[in-house]
């Protein structure tokens, strides 16, 4: 997270850290007792490592009563996701068991109405991704409020040049932005999950390269079918 600040501890009980061999790789969001939503591209970086999900965390390194690491029973990338595109960049991870819910671990309601968020709406993004262009990684969860950017502007030739489909949304990236390591994390508008940070190798914090987020409402049927 660039241009953000430390999040209120455990105020985002839906926040997950997708880890490989004990190291944070991507963000994720608890959407049901046994399911975490993240980005499909995160799995590519996992290679053959052991994928686990950390819930109830604020600090990645310090002991916290609510923290628990879950093994992954099943990883379900969207069937149309591809390594060479950010289209359909969603991944569902089934935990080895139902998460123990409490004040610091709770699923987040996700948007089912397939309608664009109004441009200018301030949405919350959180993650353990890098906090500087030098690549500094935070130990504690960071967050930032970002305004939603209209798709037409995002698709300008000078910006993402038509790459943003109806199933994606953009947010401003002018010095405040999501970045490497935040992929798979939640974009929350009005307390509801609207988007998931895509995991392309986009430059961060450059206003001409807005953040790209996969719109969860556009994938409601797929999410429901996997969770069923």
């Amino acid at each position: 997270i660039l241009g953000g600040r430390e999040a209120e501890a455990h105020a985002r009980p839906y926040m997950a850290s997708v880890q490989v061999n004990g190291e944070h790789l991507c963000g994720g969001v608890l959407v049901a007792e046994q399911w975490v939503l993240s980005a499909a591209h995160c799995l590519e970086d996992a290679a053959d490592g052991k994928v686990q999900v950390l819930l109830g965390a604020h600090s990645l390194s310090q002991p916290e009563p609510s923290k628990r690491l879950y093994d992954v029973l099943r990883a379900v990338p969207h069937p149309d996701s591809r390594p060479d595109t950010i289209d359909h960049d969603l991944l569902l991870l089934q935990l080895s068991e139902k998460a123990t819910l409490g004040p610091a671990v709770r699923p987040l309601p996700w948007q089912r109405v397939d309608r664009d968020v109004e441009p200018g709406t301030l949405c919350d993004v959180a993650g353990w991704g890098i906090v500087s262009h030098a690549g500094r990684r935070p130990d504690r969860l960071q967050h930032v409020l970002l305004p939603v950017l209209d798709r037409a502007t995002c698709n300008r030739r000078t910006h993402h040049d038509g790459a943003i489909t109806q199933r994606m949304m953009c947010a401003e990236s002018n010095r405040r932005d999501s970045c490497k390591g935040d992929s798979g994390g939640p974009l929350v508008c009005g307390g509801v999950l609207e988007g998931v940070v895509t995991s392309g190798s986009r430059v961060c914090g450059n206003r001409k390269k807005p953040g790209i987020y996969t719109r969860v409402a556009s994938y409601a049927a797929w999410i429901d079918s996997v969770l069923a």
Epitope: E172, G190, G191
Partner: antibody, heavy 121, light 106 residues
Amino acid sequence: EVQLQQSGPELVKPGASVKISCKASDNSFTGYYMHWVKQSHGNILDWIGYIDPYNGVSSYNQKFKGKATLTVDKSSSTAYMEIRSLTSEDSAVYYCASYYGSSPYWYFDVWGTGTTVTVSS
Amino acid sequence: QIVLSQSPAILSASPGEKVTMTCRASSSVSYMHWYQQKPGSSPKPWIYATSNLASGVPARFSGSGSGTSHFLTISRLEAEDAATYFCQQWSSNPYTFGGGTKLEIK
């Protein structure tokens, strides 16, 4: 606790412009969006827009586009709102407001002292 | 834009009574905020995200609701509760406020 101190009351003529200020008491001014709200007679609250002091990004309620302009001076931790082409409809109390918390459920947890603008010939 | 309608516009009740005011939205709002304002003062945050009390708000206040209907309830009214209460949605730009409920103490 952060405080937002606004400039004093203004009596202005129709057609003129007015620029009101909102000074934050702490030095983390650039970390937080500054919103402006109009309270008309009859107590109606209208959100005007916001500006991000960190990067200058702003967003306006369509109703106030062309009427209000939001700016900031980072060096003095002050936000400004200019209202132009004033009419009697613009007579109101104007508040700056911000969210200084860090939960995902942002709201206006700090409000300015309010500036009364009276438009009269 | 999302239009918020508050009712009643004026609510008159006696100390010790339980009172409830309503905020209805023209389209679904997952969470609602509430502010208290007394004459001559700036609004104060009162309840955020539907049911969370802002700092310093007495426990006799509570918030509830979902979708298009949200409520602010005072379990036992006290004289100091006399004020106007505004609801506000933050789901969508432009952020909108209700017209307010003025609470008067008999």
